[in-house]
């Protein structure tokens, strides 16, 4: 989703880890939303 950043070596070295971090963050957000929804 960031084509220009692909020229940066950092992108190559961290791509998988950043994707994992993003997935984990989305999972945590979804869980927080579920807790809020359940409490309503």
């Amino acid at each position: 989703d960031n084509p220009s950043l692909s020229i940066d070596l950092t992108f190559h070295l961290l791509r998988t880890l950043l994707e994992l971090a993003r997935t984990q963050s989305q999972r945590e957000r979804a869980e927080q939303n579920r807790i809020i929804f359940d409490s309503v």
């Epitope: 989703d1 960031n2 220009s4 950043l5 020229i7 940066d8 070596l9 950092t10 992108f11 190559h12 070295l13 961290l14 880890l17 950043l18 971090a21 993003r22």
Partner: antibody
Amino acid sequence: EVQLQQSGPELVKPGASVKMSCKASGYTFTDYFMKWVKQSHGESLEWIGVINPNNGDIFYNQKFKGKATLTVDKSSSTAFMQLNSLTSEDSAVYSCARGTDRALFAYWGQGTLVAVSA
Amino acid sequence: DVLMTQTPLSLPVSLGDQASISCRSGQSIVHSDGNTYLEWYLQRPGQSPRLLIYKVSNRFSGVPDRFSGSGSGTDFTLKISRVGAEDLGIYYCFQGSHIPWTFGGGTKLEVK
């Protein structure tokens, strides 16, 4: 010419927070990740974390999770780092750095000195 | 974390001499892509670090050819032929193959 201009020195009290800046020029800010490095007095270098200026994705060195918070302002091509709950252990020079397609720390800011003292 | 150990801690040289700095990693720093992300930096007194060598042996733009890097796996060397006054300072090796990225403790190159 790639330039990373950092904010000035900070003298702060234990327990306080500090926010420093790193203004980028000479290249397209969103083309490269921004990294932050700590150098304690007379000591080696420690990588703190890295931020993607496009979407704010951050990856921290586990050691600095909870201590450092990285952000960017795309409109001013500026990266920020906030350090919280400061102790004497946080007294150091903090530098921002940018890589290239070949290396991770090709260009460096001049560093921001943070002194934590009561 | 990958420990990067540099030797010697201090290296006194006469200007014009050759200098050699060693860097050893606690484990192989060959990345899963086959590359070895070993870099060398020089920090002159009162200045920010400056990139000299990337991927073990490649000189960064503007770096004189008297600087050369070599090594593989866990053992790496930076050589400076004909040391000049502008080469004095602290040299750091760095690995970017494993997270967290780590720097060596530094080698101070000084005049004998």
